[in-house]
């Protein structure tokens, strides 16, 4: 995701209200949650904490030599976490899903 | 990676010469290869071919409503391929790695 060029790739808070994105029509609770986001740049040299793939390292080195040829690697979620939600099923019955996968960022990295 | 806003997230060619990135000091062959890159935007609605995670969908919806609050999801490699390389060991002996992982983009997606 986008981020200030001055900061390196990291996880930051992103409060999401389900009403804002139109999901309140089927998600009863929670009303909002922290999805987090991955923000910041993938600068040379890529640190171990951004768990770069070999391709990300190669792309970073190419960008360093030819900035107009290719962009930097991108700071993205590399591991996601589930949240628990109470939602309305097809018949409008409130149903609990303990593990609604991939909703929140657990880790960010350069890809 | 970066990309023209007019095109959607896709895999494009990126020829990498190992001499350009300083890896010719240990990689004997190949001299160059296609690393590919992921280029283009992650626009609403995210298509199935960019295999969006739930988090990417949420982030896209938040960006749609509050463009300054959070950026769009990013077009990145979601699957990488290996290449075979011939490299010099510490003693300068040419050695083959049949399956040098994560060097080339196989698939791109919005994350």
């Amino acid at each position: 995701s986008t981020g200030a060029a001055s900061s390196h790739c990291q996880k930051t808070s992103l409060r999401v209200n389900f009403e804002d994105i139109g999901w309140d029509s089927w998600i009863i609770a929670p009303k909002e949650y922290d999805a987090y986001e991955c923000k910041g740049g993938c600068f040379f040299p890529l640190a171990d904490d951004v768990t770069p793939t070999k391709h990300a390292i190669v792309q970073t080195l190419v960008h360093l030599k030819f900035p107009t040829k290719v962009g930097k690697a991108c700071c993205v979620p590399t591991k996601l976490s589930p949240i628990s939600i109470l939602y309305k099923d097809d018949m409008g019955v409130p149903t609990l899903k303990y593990h609604y996968e991939g909703m929140s960022v657990a880790e960010c990295g350069c890809r | 990676s970066t990309g023209a806003a007019s095109s959607h997230c896709q895999k494009t060619s990126l020829r990498v010469n190992f001499e350009d990135i300083g890896w010719d000091s240990w990689i004997i062959a190949p001299k160059e290869y296609d690393a590919y890159e992921c280029k283009g935007g992650c626009f609403f609605p995210l298509a199935d071919d960019v295999t969006p995670t739930k988090h990417a969908i949420v982030q896209t919806l938040v960006h749609l409503k509050f463009p300054t609050k959070v950026g769009k999801a990013c077009c990145v490699p979601t699957k990488l391929s290996p290449i075979s390389i011939l490299y010099k060991d510490d003693m300068g002996v040419p050695t083959l790695k049949y399956h040098y992982e994560g060097m080339s983009v196989a698939e791109c997606g919005c994350r």
Epitope: - | P82, I83, L86, D89, D90, V93, T95, L96, Y98, H99
Partner: antibody
Framework: EVQLVESGGGLVKPGGSLRLSCAAS????????MSWVRQAPGKGLEWVGR??????????DYAAPVKGRFTISRDDSKNTLYLQMNSLKTEDTAVYYC?????WGQGTLVTVSS | QSVLTQPPSASGTPGQRVTISCSVT????????VHWYQQLPGTAPKLLFF??YRPSGVSDRFSGSKSGTSASLAIVGLQSEDEGYYYC???????????FGGGTKLTVLG
Amino acid sequence: EVQLVESGGGLVKPGGSLRLSCAASGFTFSNAWMSWVRQAPGKGLEWVGRIKSKTEGGDTDYAAPVKGRFTISRDDSKNTLYLQMNSLKTEDTAVYYCTTGTYWGQGTLVTVSS
Amino acid sequence: QSVLTQPPSASGTPGQRVTISCSVTNTDIDIFNVHWYQQLPGTAPKLLFFHDYRPSGVSDRFSGSKSGTSASLAIVGLQSEDEGYYYCAGLDEAMRGPVFGGGTKLTVLG
């Protein structure tokens, strides 16, 4: 000079076991990814499996016909590669080569027969 | 049936040019990674060509090329000592290791 010397081949009954060794010299063995490749009598080359260097996790991968029966290991202090072969079948009869991909040993013959 | 298809045999007279082909018939194999081995009678295989790299001791009479889904090994100025088997090898991504072609037996006539 790079040298790879296999040993441990011989005659074994179906269902039996055998351990092959490969003594390496002339290169940085500990950093090398090492493979075993076999060649049945009068046939072509067939990859058996590979072990990565310990610094890269020491992961092993195997060809489908030997998976679950063969195990590759290495002892970097002895510059030696091993291939433990269990539940041997007649179709495992072959000359077994250890290789870095660039350099190959002379091979050792394994015959599985009752 | 190998996923790398080679002709079972090839032949030529001394001094001639001979080409051995290797065709990829599996999407798990990228032609980019295909390389060549030589196995002379009664000896272990030897790396002949890897991309544009020819190991020391390998004659410059041997050269490799790739086009589409096919790789080729060319031998110019054929000599009797070139007689043996030639194998192409590629990286099988699914298998996570090399896969070999069936091999081509090269015979030097006369």
